[in-house]
């Protein structure tokens, strides 16, 4: 019956929420076979390499990290995907030329404290928000 | 003097915060000449197209929208870039093969209410968070 069919579909949704779209695309991995899933990558940034050594006193650099990787169907739990990202993934499967995959972006960012010279050559200690990537997800 | 040079650099930072890196790379527009800047794009999603019409009663679809576009140097104010995204853009300029550009992702998401059948065919009204893209930015 329609009622039991709905129950079955709903159960499928709970256990593998994205299988509803599996029927629509055989393979979306054409250009991403070598790519890993969205995750945090380690990155140390030297302020000298950015050309900022003359105004930033300390630190000399910091562990900024970055996010990279695929947000491909199906989005696993560890990808910290928003509801919109899940919907967008399904729409991308149907219309890859029109709608991109969700992108791998920071979900948690930390601040760092920087000692620097201001316009008047005063030494300032300032906390800069959203400087360090702590976690990544599909957005 | 070093002091006046710092003042000048600091002034440059204030007025055009990313010019500090302009000295290091002439062009990063190798693969993005035709792409527009990161922004919100309109997208209506039909639940029937997702194969969800049997369990979602209402609405029939909704304006989900999505984010797309380049997060290239220099990141303008309207790109809602985080401090980390600004740093990442500069690192990408120097090492494009190692660090990607920041990605264009939702910065504001809204909820929608959905009327649907649960596992037991009960009709449920539920608010789903982070379903609609209201604004995009470089992250």
């Amino acid at each position: 019956s329609a009622s039991s069919r709905r129950r079955q579909q709903s159960r499928n949704r709970s256990t593998q929420s994205q299988d509803v779209a599996r029927v629509s695309s055989a393979s979306d991995y054409n250009s991403s076979e070598l790519k890993t899933a969205c995750r945090k990558h380690e990155l140390y940034v030297s302020f000298q390499d950015l050309g900022w050594q003359d105004w930033i006193i300390a630190p000399k650099g910091y562990a900024a990290n970055y996010c990279d990787g695929e947000c491909s169907f199906p989005l696993n739990a560890h990808m910290n995907a928003t509801n919109h990202a899940i919907v967008q993934t399904l729409v991308h499967l149907m219309n890859p030329e029109y709608v991109p995959k969700p992108c791998c972006a920071p979900t948690k960012l930390n601040a760092i404290s920087v000692l620097y010279f201001d316009d008047n050559s005063n030494v300032i200690l300032k906390k800069y928000r959203n400087m360090v990537v702590r976690a990544c997800g599909c957005h | 003097s070093a002091s006046s040079r710092r003042r000048q650099q600091s002034r440059n930072r204030s007025t055009q915060s990313q010019d500090v890196a302009r000295v290091s790379s002439a062009s990063d527009y190798n693969s993005s000449e035709l792409k527009t800047a990161c922004r919100k794009h309109e997208l209506y999603v039909s639940f029937q197209d997702l194969g969800w019409q049997d369990w979602i009663i209402a609405p029939k679809g909704y304006a989900a929208n999505y984010c797309d576009g380049e997060c290239s140097f220099p990141l303008n104010a309207h790109m809602n870039a985080t401090n980390h995204a600004i740093v990442q853009t500069l690192v990408h300029l120097m090492n494009p093969e190692y660090v990607p550009k920041p990605c264009c992702a939702p910065t504001k998401l809204n909820a929608i209410s959905v009327l649907y059948f649960d596992d037991n065919s009960n009709v449920i009204l539920k608010k789903y968070r982070n379903m609609v893209v209201r604004a995009c930015g470089c992250h």
Partner: antibody
Framework: EVQLVESGGGLVQPGGSLRLSCAAS????????MSWVRQAPGKGLEWVSA????????YYTDSVKGRFTMSRDNSKNTLYLQMNSLRAEDTAVYYC???????????WGQGTLVTVSS | EIVLTQSPGTLSLSPGEGATLSCRAS???????LAWYQQKPGQAPRLLIY???SRATGIPDRFSGSGSGTDFTLTISRLEPEDFVVYYC?????????FGGGTKVEIK
């Protein structure tokens, strides 16, 4: 010891295609970006293309965009340059080179000669 | 695109003499991303200097680099017979990676 060995060069007619390979050894290939650089006979060095460690991002000099495709097979520690619609001005020795993060090209392969002539 | 101009095109000197090779950028570049290479006939280029002034592994101390902004210099303090080859500067801070046209150091 880090080693890069190019192969696949040869004589090809204008409009033809050629695929160059670069076999890498002595380092964790997938962790490094790689580039192709060419040198026309008696001329200077010209960067051609670059690829990220995963192969996900590629970059090209303007004169080869749409004609050349750079790729890599990390399971085989091999770099490739697929060259289509070849022109006389593509005649050169093609070198592959490793580019560590924040660093210049080091080392380079010995090069392979590509001659485009009718 | 950053254009690198090397001068002179050819430098005629005698063994034991010092050589000064110039590399000028079309716009200011970070010294962190300026390199020098040596190329012997029939061989691949070899990295000499990176970060404008740091010697690569195994490079003799007669080779030194300096400069900032738009003007960079490679100095060879005392020319040995094997130094009479071609030298290139390179900007490697982002694509396109550009090379200078080269300076040939020849025996006078």
């Amino acid at each position: 010891e880090v080693q890069l060995v190019e192969s696949g060069g040869g004589l090809v007619q204008p409009g033809g295609s050629l695929r160059l390979s670069c076999a890498a050894s002595g380092f964790t290939f997938s962790s490094y970006a790689m580039s192709w650089v060419r040198q026309a006979p008696g001329k200077g060095l010209e960067w051609v293309s670059a690829i990220s460690g995963s192969g996900g991002r590629t970059y090209y000099t303007d004169s080869v965009k749409g004609r050349f495709t750079m790729s890599r097979d990390n399971s085989k520690n091999t770099l490739y340059l697929q060259m289509n619609s070849l022109r006389a001005e593509d005649t050169a020795v093609y070198y592959c080179a490793k580019r560590p993060y924040n660093s210049p090209f080091d080392p380079w392969g010995q090069g392979t000669l590509v001659t485009v002539s009718s | 695109e950053i254009v690198l101009t090397q001068s002179p095109g050819t430098l005629s000197l005698s063994p034991g003499e010092g050589a000064t090779l110039s590399c000028r950028a079309s716009q200011s570049v970070s010294s962190s991303y300026l390199a020098w290479y040596q190329q012997k006939p029939g061989q691949a280029p070899r990295l000499l200097i990176y970060g404008a002034s740091s010697r690569a592994t195994g490079i003799p101390d007669r080779f030194s680099g300096s400069g900032s902004g738009t003007d960079f210099t490679l100095t060879i303090s005392r020319l040995e017979p094997e130094d009479f080859v071609v030298y290139y500067c390179q900007h490697f801070g982002g694509t396109p990676f550009t090379f200078g046209g080269g300076t040939k150091v020849e025996i006078k």
